[in-house]
């Protein structure tokens, strides 16, 4: 649960100010751009040559509680004939994201940032390794 | 800067507890799973049939300060011959992510969550609309 180097300076007050009480910060309620949404996808997960499924994970002590993870459906990619071509590879595209973890002991509630690895979708790539016979 | 419906309950204390002072919460220092990383990509952004470039945006009052956005390089997809096939489409894969915004007025520092739309990469899809001659 360490703070990465960049975070160490980010969470500090300017040098000329009295230092922050060790261990916690003030988090304002509300979310900036809360209504921002991913545009409707038009089923790209089904129409892609590297299609994927979605699994929803749910955790009531996390914000957002619902996190969607993608899983590539194929080892290869779907060709023009709709068949799987295993000489191409479906690979996951991943993103590091922040979520907010709620922790409570009795009536004392605090929050902490948590880094999460999310698989957002899949893309079709030319394999780097070809078997030499 | 409103709190979405899910967030309204997430940020509340249990009903049996005295309510939170309106407007701010306690954010613990440190990031859970801070060392979690996207695995090395093996240049999937170049090897993909829907390749993309990256642009880095930097904001010293945001955590993380560095956010990477992808842009699809082609309208179509790259075929086996390395040529662009305009009968297929490169489309962006987007993800809603949270960042932490730092706000200061003099020596008073507070933080607020912000929702950000990140383009993580691109995938190749069969177009929905085909031109009829």
């Amino acid at each position: 649960q360490r703070v990465p180097k960049e975070g160490q300076t980010f969470f500090q007050k300017p040098e000329s100010c009295p230092s922050v009480p060790e261990g916690s910060l003030k988090l304002d309620l509300g979310i900036i751009n809360a209504n921002q949404r991913v545009p409707l996808s038009r089923n790209i997960e089904r129409r892609s040559t590297s299609p994927w499924n979605y699994t929803v994970t749910w955790d009531p002590n996390r914000y957002p509680s619902e996190v969607v993870q993608a899983q590539c459906r194929h080892l290869g990619c779907v060709n023009a004939q709709g068949k799987e071509d295993i000489f191409m590879n479906s690979v996951p595209i991943q993103q590091e994201t922040l979520v907010l973890r709620r922790k409570h002991q009795g009536c004392s509630v605090s929050f902490q940032l948590e880094k999460l690895l999310v698989t957002v979708g899949c893309t079709c790539v030319k394999p780097l390794i070809h078997h030499v016979h | 800067q409103r709190v979405p419906k899910e967030g309204q309950t997430f940020f509340q204390k249990p009903e049996s507890c005295p309510s939170v002072p309106e407007g701010s919460l306690k954010l613990d220092l440190g990031i859970i799973n801070a060392n979690q990383r996207v695995p090395l990509s093996r240049n999937i952004e170049r090897r993909s049939t829907s390749p993309w470039n990256y642009t880095v945006t930097w904001d010293p009052n945001r955590y993380p300060s560095e956010v990477v956005q992808a842009q699809c390089r082609h309208l179509g997809c790259v075929n086996a011959q390395g040529k662009e096939d305009i009968f297929m489409n490169s489309v962006p894969i987007q993800q809603e992510t949270l960042v932490l915004r730092r706000k200061h007025q003099g020596c008073s520092v507070s933080f607020q969550l912000e929702k950000l739309l990140v383009t993580v990469g691109c995938t190749c899809v069969k177009p929905l609309i085909h031109h009829v001659h």
Partner: nanobody, 123 residues
Framework: EVQLVESGGGLVQAGGSLRLSCAAS????????VGWFRQAPGKEREFIGA????????YYAVSEKDRFTISRDNGKNTLYLQMSSLKAEDTAVYYC????????????????WGQGTQVTVSS
Amino acid sequence: EVQLVESGGGLVQAGGSLRLSCAASGRTFSSYVVGWFRQAPGKEREFIGAISGSGDSIYYAVSEKDRFTISRDNGKNTLYLQMSSLKAEDTAVYYCTADQEFGYLRFGRSEYWGQGTQVTVSS
């Protein structure tokens, strides 16, 4: 970071069956292609087969298609290998492996490997 631990190996009579399991730790198991290899004494490591992240797509090395079945349970972070009609030549150490690209896994260049579990078939 993915850790893989195989189990279920042992001694079995020819013609018998065995189910191997591979338990994965790590939060993003379902983003990995996972598969099985085996290595018989004095031989090279041999690819058995692999399964996609969602479990929809499975590829077998031609020789094992009929007797071996690969499956996964993403809820349990576990990969399985069901083996039937076992023969003496199936005696080997069986390895579970994971990678985000099938092309790497298929040719034995995966990022993650288990320690292996011994299967001995007596005739």
